[in-house]
């Protein structure tokens, strides 16, 4: 089931999924002056079986001016720099994310891809928040959000993160790591059945990846 909305916005913070649950869709969009190849895929889709998950389909862009050129190669460094996303670009990909069953890792860039990646998340997806450069984190609890299904509707849990503009070179000082305790996450609908597939395993993954995510300065 797709999440009805996008993860919550936190002032001066960006979010990142460290792994994408099966069923996640990524728009195949091209940058200005380029278009999807005729009969090209509209979306990349994270699919898999019990042992392996991967992105189905390749996004392919071609020049709007030319009809038959199709390109799908790794972009040059300057093309990669041009792409931004609503999520944070992690300087290093944690190795743990590949080992999480039923999840795909970040798809590689394709040539002439749009400047923003748009994902369509599914129930059970977890995203992690980090303050943007120039802001530091004050944690009241986990700096993450999970898409949950409650009473047939989806919602994202509220990340317990405040980004303050104090002049600090390091955004995520070691002593201010997110707490793993669930008390920091307010739940108003405790009486309802909540279906969060893989929530526990993702929480465990979050704990193991905490260091690599939250101690690396945002580039």
């Amino acid at each position: 089931e797709l999440c009805d909305d996008d993860p919550p916005e936190i002032p001066h913070a960006t979010f990142k999924a460290m792994a994408y649950k099966e069923g996640t869709m990524l728009n195949c969009e091209c940058k200005r002056g380029f278009r999807r190849i005729k009969s090209g895929s509209l979306y990349m889709l994270c699919t898999g079986n019990s042992s392996h998950s991967s992105w189905d389909n390749q996004c392919q862009c071609t020049s709007s001016a030319t009809r038959n050129t199709t390109k799908q190669v790794t972009p040059q460094p300057e093309e990669q720099k041009e792409r931004k996303t609503t999520e944070m670009q992690s300087p290093m990909q944690p190795v743990d994310q590949a080992s999480l069953p039923g999840h795909c890792r970040e798809p590689p860039p394709w040539e002439n891809e749009a400047t923003e990646r748009i994902y369509h998340f599914v129930v059970g997806q977890m995203v992690y928040y980090q303050c943007v450069q120039g802001y530091r984190a004050l944690h009241r609890g986990p700096a993450e959000s999970v898409c949950k299904m409650t009473h047939g509707k989806t919602r994202w849990t509220q990340p317990q993160l405040i980004c303050t503009g104090e002049m600090e070179t390091s955004q995520f000082p070691g002593e201010e790591k997110p707490q793993a305790s669930p008390e920091g996450r307010p739940e108003s609908e405790t009486s309802c059945l909540v279906t969060t597939t893989d929530f526990q395993i993702q929480t465990e993954m979050a704990a193991t990846m905490e260091t690599s995510i939250f101690t690396t300065e945002y580039q």
């Epitope: 089931e1 797709l2 999440c3 009805d4 909305d5 996008d6 069923g23 869709m25 728009n27 195949c28 969009e29 999807r36 895929s41 509209l42 979306y43 889709l45 699919t47 189905d56 389909n57 748009i118 369509h120």
Partner: nanobody, 117 residues
Framework: EVQLVESGGGLVQPGGSLRLSCAAS??????MGWYRQAPGKQRELVAS???????GYADSVKGRFTISRDNAKKTVYLQMNSVRPEDTGVYYC?????????????WGQGTQVTVSS
């Protein structure tokens, strides 16, 4: 490939009927919607259907249009009855997320519907 191929459009007289089809190959079982874009206007949601078959409609088409799906065939339909000139536009099918605007989806070609006498 995740493909959404719309068909069934055409020229129809006011009060007439059309049935649009959307072949959703490679698409997971998710909520889907029919959208339309009238000339010079923004793309808008016409009807939606959940993976379980729950439906919703724009006020302008309630009682006239019916959305349905055949999960085995991976096809979504839009039955258009009692059509009006204001139903004219390009009709698209796509995923449906209630809180996410259509500008954030990836779009196919659509099928043209023209209501005129």
């Amino acid at each position: 490939e995740v493909q959404l191929v719309e068909s069934g459009g055409g020229l129809v007289q006011p009060g007439g009927s059309l049935r649009l089809s959307c072949a959703a190959s490679g698409m997971p079982l998710v909520a889907m919607g029919w959208y339309r874009q009238a000339p010079g206007k923004q793309r808008e949601l016409v009807a939606s259907i959940s993976s379980g078959g729950n439906t919703g409609y724009a006020d302008s088409v309630k009682g006239r249009f019916t959305i349905s799906r055949d999960n085995a065939k991976k096809t979504v339909y839009l039955q258009m009855n009692s059509v009006r000139p204001e139903d004219t536009g390009v009709y698209y099918c796509n995923i449906y997320r209630s809180q996410v605007p259509p500008t954030r989806y990836s779009w196919g070609q659509g099928t043209q519907v023209t209501v005129s006498s």
